[in-house]
Amino acid sequence: TLNSVLNSNAIKNLPPPLGGAAGHPGSAVSAAPGILYPGGNKYQTIDNYQPYPCAEDEECGTDEYCASPTRGGDAGVQICLACRKRRKRCMRHAMCCPGNYCKNGICVSSDQNNFRGEIEETITESFGNDHSTLDGYSRRTTLSSKMYHSKGQEGSVCLRSSDCATGLCCARHFWSKICKPVLKEGQVCTKHRRKGSHGLEIFQRCYCGEGLSCRIQKDHHQASNSSRLHTCQRH
């Protein structure tokens, strides 16, 4: 169903062109937190990082997972830990940084062939494209040549964040990928659940701006998982 699509964390596992150049560190092509800067939050430094208590992965930032800070430690004391880069050991998808997933105990790059069929099947079922075929989405995001001569303004279609003007990133918005503003403090952000690729996220938000990370709104702890809001908060 569309709800399961929206509540999944397929973004980090999408093949190009949907999720940008997955698995290529430094490629500024993403639409969501963590994809733009695989392997860690660009804005998060060791100096200002404060351990954030958590009970589950989705309470952490996009480039983090929830676990005990010490191996074999007390499961009741868990904090958000930095995600693991490619070739590092893992026990579940959430432990791996965006653009990677856990396979046979190792974080490996999300590979186009692994997910394309599943994504197309999900999106076709959910949206029932009226007058066109999917063709791996390349048809949906092909740009007018004009896009390459001037930076895209808010709401204009894009392929990657570099197509957009300063302060904007390229993010899916229902039907298309468009230039959206980088998020400010207090604005709603998307926290990807990173449980593997179980469909395509129809919407994407930009990442949180400098000095901010996407965390669960404290007054929403009692709400159900699917309705809890995450906002950009100071580290």
């Epitope: 569309l2 709401g155 279609v157 699917s226």
Partner: antibody, heavy 118, light 112 residues
Framework: QVQLVESGGGLVQPGGSLRLSCAAS????????MSWVRQAPGKGLEWVSV??????????YYAASVKGRFTISRDNSKNTLYLQMNSLRAEDTAVYYC?????????WGQGTLVTVSS | DIALTQPASVSGSPGQSITISCTGT?????????VSWYQQHPGKAPKLMIY???NRPSGVSNRFSGSKSGNTASLTISGLQAEDEADYYC???????????FGGGTKLTVLG
């Protein structure tokens, strides 16, 4: 500034046809998805259709109430959006707005009134 | 059919704050952390006031704010002014055939 100007509305009999146009200016038309939204007299807003930024073979979506009767299209060389309405019914009577679909419907035209009546 | 439910009318005095609710289901508003709000003055086209739950487009007063909890979204207008008197519509996305859904609209009256 962004400007959208609809035209083509008027009185038409049930079962008849009408073609609405929307002339766009002030932005790169070919870089935006575009929609039609309508509003029956004294009623709320109802989304009608949307079309991809490309004008040849682009993706289109329709509300269930108009699917099979209405066709959305665009001509990027003319910066114009169209809505071909066939088999019109009394319940299609409304002001039809052309809207730019950027981050949601971020710019709207002034609307054109379509009256379906015998 | 109106997919999202809004109160038909709300009112407030200048300077006060008012909140307009918008209730949907898990198939639309509740299934997305995306909701937009539009302002429409009589005889005019709608204007986007809030998108993505709580984001304001440039040029929209910071007196307008949005929030969402579960299947209900809210638009709050603080420091009510006479020019705020208008109809307000919420909008979300939905699964199924109707991919875009609007609320039935709320008429805001600024008293006095």
């Amino acid at each position: 500034q962004v400007q959208l100007v609809e035209s083509g509305g008027g009185l038409v009999q049930p079962g008849g046809s009408l073609r609405l146009s929307c002339a766009a200016s002030g932005f790169t038309f070919s870089s935006y998805w575009m929609s039609w939204v309508r509003q029956a007299p004294g009623k709320g807003l109802e989304w009608v259709s949307v079309i991809e930024h490309k004008d040849k073979g682009g993706t289109t979506y329709y509300a269930a109430s108009v699917k099979g009767r209405f066709t959305i299209s665009r001509d990027n060389s003319k910066n114009t959006l169209y809505l071909q309405m066939n088999s019109l019914r009394a319940e299609d009577t409304a002001v039809y707005y052309c809207a730019r679909h950027g981050i949601d419907f971020d710019h709207w035209g002034q609307g054109t009134l379509v009256t379906v009546s015998s | 059919d109106i997919a999202l439910t809004q109160p038909a009318s709300v009112s407030g005095s200048p300077g006060q704050s008012i909140t307009i609710s918008c209730t949907g289901t898990s198939s639309d508003l509740g299934g997305y952390n995306y909701v937009s709000w539009y302002q429409q003055h009589p005889g005019k086209a709608p204007k986007l006031m809030i998108y993505d739950v709580n984001n304001r487009p440039s040029g929209v007063s910071n007196r307008f704010s949005g929030s969402k909890s579960g299947n209900t979204a809210s638009l709050t207008i603080s420091g009510l002014q006479a020019e705020d008197e208008a109809d307000y519509y919420c909008q979300s996305y939905a699964s199924g055939n109707t991919k875009v859904v609007f609320g039935g609209g709320t008429k805001l009256t600024v008293l006095g």
